[in-house]
């Protein structure tokens, strides 16, 4: 993604992202000279983030609504250069990405929305889904961010088993090198998982589309 | 026309067991988030459980968490309410409700009711 | 939990009075409130949800208003099908917790 149009919006972030910025930021004002392990940053962010309250989330929340009509107005502009519609190649027994809070909601409600719409395009199933999850209060919307926090702490043990397993011989020279380029990626992938997430969506309802009539 | 018909309420002993079952109707169950509320003699409600439409996400009130179950069959239209560890104040009667909108709890149709109580 | 507090706890009043129910949280519960009638020995039936919001079916002699920690439930003009108790119920945070409800009975 670093390696993209320099022109392109940057992604949107969630409300987690922001909370994470922000303990970063707390972070390094507290100790500016003192190095970061990502792992036990990561870890401690997201044991603070289960624990907040709705009302404290809600600031974060706010941020991360601000930020998608942001990068949603930038994208209407926003003109990708020629040929650029190639996608990264993916390996496909690479662990799955594990899916949002709001993407497990959307499965949930994804039935009833299309059910009592049978016209409604794709889009607009996503957006009256949307419309959906936030007006959600955050206690309900718990019940999903809990299971997403196991799914996403699943995946990093998996992601963490499959990159020390398998690595062929050119990539193992450079282990040093891409342990200093791994914090820069996993923040990388942050903002790549929600638009892989989107895609991922938009397949689900292709494949739902297909699978309608047994419902 | 919606309808949600609760079964399975009874006189039981402190610490027994009871399986109470709502049979729904008039409506796609398996596209809304169902639940249970209650209501002592004489007092207010209280809310107890809630199951999402797969079935898959759970919340309960804190005063059955660890002793009742919600649980549904899409293919029965049923939901259930599995409760042990009964105590007194488990009388009442319980409501199997229809949350219309989404995850939020705004219970749009009530079933009848049935009677659980527990005594000696 | 957030505990919600009705007033009065009973009410007598007469067909085709105007008629005010509130509804108190002890924190804000932005617009997550919603308003039950329960007549003796049947099941609650919704009337108001997300504060104003008129369920399909019930009649505009009732309306509901309010933000924040404090609701009201309104009967325009008192009908004899109407007596009966009204509850107010936060959708805001679990527990989703009730009021004690409030008696309206003929006077």
């Known amino acids: 993604m670093g390696k993209g149009d320099p022109k392109k919006p940057r992604g949107k972030m969630s409300s987690y992202a922001f909370f994470v910025q922000t303990c970063r930021e707390e972070h390094k004002k507290k100790h500016p000279d003192a190095s970061v392990n990502f792992s036990e940053f990561s870890k401690k962010c997201s044991e603070r983030w289960k624990t907040m309250s709705a009302k404290e989330k809600g600031k974060f929340e706010d941020m991360a609504k601000a930020d998608k009509a942001r990068y949603e107005r930038e994208m209407k502009t926003y003109i990708p250069p020629k040929g650029e519609t190639k996608k990264k190649f993916k390996d496909p027994n690479a662990p799955k990405r594990p899916p949002s809070a709001f993407f497990l909601f959307c499965s949930e409600y994804r039935p009833k929305i299309k059910g009592e719409h049978p016209g409604l395009s794709i889009g607009d199933v996503a957006k009256k889904l949307g419309e959906m999850w936030n007006n959600t209060a955050a206690d309900d919307k718990q019940p999903y961010e809990k299971k997403a926090a196991k799914l996403k702490e699943k995946y990093e043990k998996d992601i963490a088993a499959y990159r020390a397993k398998g690595k062929p011989d050119a990539a193992k020279k450079g282990v040093v090198k891409a342990e200093k380029s791994k914090k820069k990626k996993e923040e990388e992938e942050d903002e790549e998982d929600e638009e892989d997430e989107e895609e991922e969506e938009d397949e689900e309802d292709e494949d739902e589309e297909e699978d309608d009539d047994d419902e | 026309e919606v309808q949600l018909l609760e079964s399975g309420g009874g006189l039981v002993q402190p610490g027994g067991s009871l399986r109470l079952s709502c049979a729904a109707s008039g409506f796609t169950f398996s596209w809304y988030e169902t639940g249970w509320v209650r209501q002592a003699p004489g007092k207010g409600l209280e809310w107890v459980s809630g199951?999402?439409?797969?079935?898959?996400?759970?919340q309960y009130a804190d005063s059955v968490k660890g002793r009742f179950t919600i649980s549904r069959d899409n293919s029965k239209n049923t939901l259930y309410l599995q409760m042990n560890s009964l105590r007194a104040e488990d009388t009442a009667v319980y409501y199997c409700a229809r949350s219309g909108v989404g995850a939020t709890k705004i219970f749009d149709y009530w079933g009848q009711g049935t009677l659980v109580t527990v005594s000696s | 939990d957030i505990q919600m507090t009705q007033s009065p706890s009973s009410l007598s009043a007469s067909v085709g009075d105007r008629v005010t129910i509130i509804c108190r949280a002890n924190e804000r519960i932005n617009t997550y409130l919603n308003w039950y009638q329960q007549k003796p020995g049947k099941a609650p039936k919704l009337l108001i949800s997300?504060?104003?919001s008129l369920e399909s079916g019930v009649p505009s002699r009732f309306s509901g208003s309010g933000s924040g920690t404090e609701f009201t439930l309104s009967i325009s003009s008192l009908q004899p099908e109407d007596f009966a108790s009204y509850y107010c119920?936060?959708?805001?945070?679990?527990?989703?917790?009730f009021g004690q409800g409030t008696n309206l009975e003929i006077r």
């Open positions: 199951i999402s439409p797969s079935g898959g996400y759970t």
């Open positions: 997300g504060t104003s």
């Open positions: 119920q936060q959708s805001y945070s679990s527990p989703y917790t």
